[in-house]
Amino acid sequence: QKSSIEKCSVDIQQSRNKTTERPGLLNCPIYWQQLREKCLLFSHTVNPWNNSLADCSTKESSLLLIRDKDELIHTQNLIRDKAILFWIGLNFSLSEKNWKWINGSFLNSNDLEIRGDAKENSCISISQTSVYSEYCSTEIRWICQKELTPVRNKVYPDS
Amino acid sequence: QKSSIEKCSVDIQQSRNKTTERPGLLNCPIYWQQLREKCLLFSHTVNPWNNSLADCSTKESSLLLIRDKDELIHTQNLIRDKAILFWIGLNFSLSEKNWKWINGSFLNSNDLEIRGDAKENSCISISQTSVYSEYCSTEIRWICQKELTPVRNKVYPDS
């Protein structure tokens, strides 16, 4: 049974004007870089893919999601060292035998040319020039993203 | 090599006044419920624990982190059906043989009375009345959280 205070709090929240603008980020936080409508955090430390996912999540952000080749190239332009790899939000789904973004969508095969195997425990990293399949347990850097622009009436229905 | 446009964008961003207030969330988004200083999203669909973690991340949020017994009880008061389980951001770390929150901290044994085994591939769910250890591959609902209050110059020191 909900306490009356909790019920009231929820009722008030749910009855609020649903078109209120949620402010979003006006500037990127310290350590983050702006790239178009996103703020990106390029880690300096290293982590396995799962820990990288969790780190972005606890920063209320997401492992990087790349829409298309153009966004990939612009992101790679921000990587200063050729030898460094960064985890992004894409890994191999064994049950669906396909590369799957952490938002649940599947990779469009034209978007990224992946070097390496598509198999269990494979996660995707990017470098300044390429996209690689790596063992998800490998400790490398990672990229978190936050949306920069205020979004009016953003709904997040239910993935 | 950064393109001149990208370099400019990054330089401008990095030279901004670093003490600008980042607004945070002023209201909870639609479908999210306010509970004290958090916004909570109780999913309607079901997912394994890993997918739930990823889903919260892509919503720029985190699987629920519960500070203490009081917060657990208040969260449980928002669950309307006794029979429904929700993943939270706590799973069993085999290497450390302990329950571990996704922010890296370990469970204080006094906080939650867990029903079920502490073993490999175990993740924690909550119901209206209890806290359960479940196989992480089980498909159940989940709870995401966002911090509600505006934070001045937040650098995410202790995510």
Partner: antibody, heavy 121, light 107 residues
């Protein structure tokens, strides 16, 4: 209370070994990369070694490579530095240090009080 | 390794003075520079990170600027408690390196 507390320092002969420990409390230790930094008497700060949050990646200054080993036990919230083949120039106060953000190696916002290691015959 | 050169190595100043310390990196480190204050027998204290971000709890008389290879720490009005040694540190690449330090002494 948020703190780091080093222990294990002392007097040791050249060629000898010591193991330093750093007990962390008040923050989520397992989420952060950690470092050891040292300071010889009357000298500046010198970074010695770093370890990733999960402990699988370690890094060393050239001056200690092959002689020192950094490790951590996240279940005990403890950082270690095993120092072998010690030399007179290793004499210093050794600090453990935590970075401000979990994505960074440095920008150390939390330091221990330090433990003195003296290498002398 | 990236070398950091601090100047001056020492400076004599009076309470109320404006003090400026510079740090030059041997290669581009973007904004990955921090400044620390250290008093005798104590651990260093983080003042500035990411070149210009003031660490929580640090007085606003401290400020940092610069990017690339040239950085500056400024104390706008020196207070008695500010007499100490100041170090810059780069956080761009491993190994992490520190400048040689600048001692701020009472004139």
């Amino acid at each position: 209370e948020v703190q780091l507390l080093e222990s294990g320092g002392g007097l040791v002969q050249p060629g000898g070994s010591l193991r330093l420990s750093c007990a962390a409390s008040g923050f989520t230790f397992s989420q952060y990369a950690m470092s050891w930094v040292r300071q010889a008497p009357g000298k500046g700060l010198e970074w010695v070694s770093a370890i990733s949050a999960v402990g699988g990646s370690t890094y060393y200054a050239d001056s200690v490579k092959g002689r020192f080993t950094i490790s951590r036990d996240n279940s005990k919230n403890t950082l270690y530095l095993q120092m072998n083949s010690l030399r007179a120039e290793d004499t210093a106060v050794y600090y453990c240090a935590k970075p401000l953000d979990s994505s960074q190696w440095a920008d150390f916002d939390l330091w221990g009080r330090g433990t003195l290691v003296t290498v002398s015959s | 390794d990236i070398q950091l050169t601090q100047s001056p190595s020492s400076v004599s100043a009076s309470v109320g003075d404006r003090v400026t310390i510079t740090c030059r990196a041997s290669q581009d480190i973007s904004s990955w520079l921090a400044w620390y204050q250290q008093k005798p027998g104590k651990a260093p204290k983080l003042l500035i990170y990411a070149a210009s971000a003031l660490q929580s709890g640090v007085p606003s008389r401290f400020s940092g600027s610069g990017s690339g290879t040239d950085f500056t720490l400024t104390i706008s009005s020196l207070q008695p408690e500010d007499f100490a040694t100041y170090y810059c540190q780069q956080a761009d690449v491993l190994p992490i390196t520190f400048g040689g330090g600048t001692k701020v002494e009472i004139k």
